[in-house]
């Protein structure tokens, strides 16, 4: 675009240099050239000469009219054809922009990733505005009434050091651009309720060489949160459908989870956790791939079978990934597995 240009005249835009996309726009060019009575005044958009809808208003001024201007950005300049000059003479230039007022930000979510020292707030911005749009995040203490504000483009990280006067806050986001302003709905936040445990990691897996081979998955987290609820999902690499197992975890030691899987198959495992009774989940851990060993026993064990004597029914989901790019968006199907209660041992054996 044109940042600084020495004008020999003026150029102005109605309704303004930033306007709503789809509006009719008039751009005026007024020359103030010395030693020139221009035969013609010409308009250029993005370097290309315009041919239509140009009106000569008087000796010094011309106008170009655009019906329903819908380009996000354009740079305009105008020139004069001066008698006796081989080249056209530049009069002036302007950057113009069209866009939309912002939508009200939606789906505002704030979380504290354990050990991060920040509260991270995200939101949906809505439809593209095509023009510079800023977001003002308001954080108001419900105890002291003090309000803090933070400027952001798409999300914000707020140091928990600046949130020490209170535990309860009201958070909302204001979207602002040249064409308008909208507020999100307000979100009530209690700092103790939005902590997401430190990342869970699957460290290794092994398949035993028993008559009934079982796969043991080892996983851990550095979380200091005592009560944690987790999900582990798994599937063969050739399958679209995940099986999901739920359980409570205590990360003072490495977790061990047992699975009875199809032999000679490649499985993918992922885990995620949340503080028990809270609503914010970790993202799924990185995929962990494990190859089960070839079948040695005579009996063909099914994935849902369990060797435990004492069993309680546990509902587990099967989820079908809609897209490999969106692993979080799934279609829920119902299934049932059994959760065994081993007689001894302080780790969690789950069949």
């Amino acid at each position: 675009g044109i940042t600084s240009i020495n004008c020999s005249g003026d150029m102005w835009v109605e309704p303004g240099e930033i306007f709503q996309m789809g509006m009719n726009v008039s751009i005026y060019c007024q020359e103030a050239l010395k030693h020139c009575r221009p035969r013609n005044l010409y308009f250029y958009k993005n370097g290309f000469k315009e041919e239509f809808d140009i009106t000569r208003i008087n000796r010094t001024t011309a106008r170009i009219w655009y019906k329903g201007f819908s380009e996000p950005h354009a740079y305009m300049h105008c020139t004069a054809e001066c008698p006796g000059h081989f080249q056209e003479t530049l009069i002036c230039g302007k950057d113009i922009s069209s866009g939309h007022p912002p939508d009200a930000p939606s789906n505002l979510t704030c979380v504290i990733y354990e050990y991060s020292g920040n509260m991270t707030c995200t939101w949906n911005t809505g439809k593209p505005t095509y023009i510079d749009t800023k977001y003002i995040v308001h954080v108001k203490s419900l105890e002291t009434e003090e309000e803090q504000q933070y400027l952001a483009s798409s999300y914000v990280k707020i140091s928990t050091d600046s949130l020490q006067g209170s535990r309860k806050y009201l958070v909302w986001v204001q979207a602002v651009n040249s064409l308008g302003m909208e507020n999100s709905q307000q979100l009530h936040v209690h700092l103790d309720d939005i902590v997401i445990p430190s990342a869970s990691i699957i460290s290794r897996a092994e398949t035993t060489n028993d008559t009934v081979p079982k796969t043991i998955v080892y996983w851990k987290s550095k979380t200091m949160i005592e009560k944690v609820f987790c999900e582990m999902r798994y599937k063969t690499t050739t399958n679209q459908t995940w099986s999901v197992k739920e359980f409570d975890a205590n990360f003072t030691y490495v977790q061990q989870s047992e699975f009875y899987l199809e032999p000679d198959s490649k499985y993918v495992f992922q885990v995620r956790c949340q503080e028990t009774g809270k609503r914010n989940w970790q993202p799924w851990s990185s995929p962990f791939v494990h190859q089960t060993s070839q079948e040695t026993g005579k009996r063909n064990w099914q994935p849902w079978s369990s060797p435990f004597v004492h069993q309680t029914s546990q509902t587990v989901s099967q989820v079908t990934a809609k897209s490999s790019h969106e692993p979080q968006k799934m279609e829920m199907l119902s299934a049932t597995i059994f959760r065994g209660h081993p007689a001894s041992g302080n780790h969690q054996d789950i069949g």
Partner: nanobody, 116 residues
Amino acid sequence: QVQLQESGGGLVQPGGSLRLSCAASGFTFRLSAMRWVRQAPGKGLEWVSGIDSRGSTIYADSVEGRFTISKDNAKNTLYLQLNSLKTEDTAMYYCAQGVYGDTYSGSQGTQVTVSS
């Protein structure tokens, strides 16, 4: 209570520069977002620029690229550097708490006059 005192205004020619200051007291300045607003003769209040506690800034289209907002937490002072001044920048300038909005809380303001 919250106190804000603007200074630094004056008479300047078109194309000239000024630096406005706003001395703040009565609140935790380092955690506060601040803004400048102005009122031209016979016109309503107009928001000019804002800054949050981390130094992120936002400007009105009419001053973008010419004005610069900043804050010095050690001195509890907000600044507005005005460059390439135009006659239409002539106004009373006020500082206020909060990033955005065309209101102020009754401070005295500082007059900027741009004239040849």
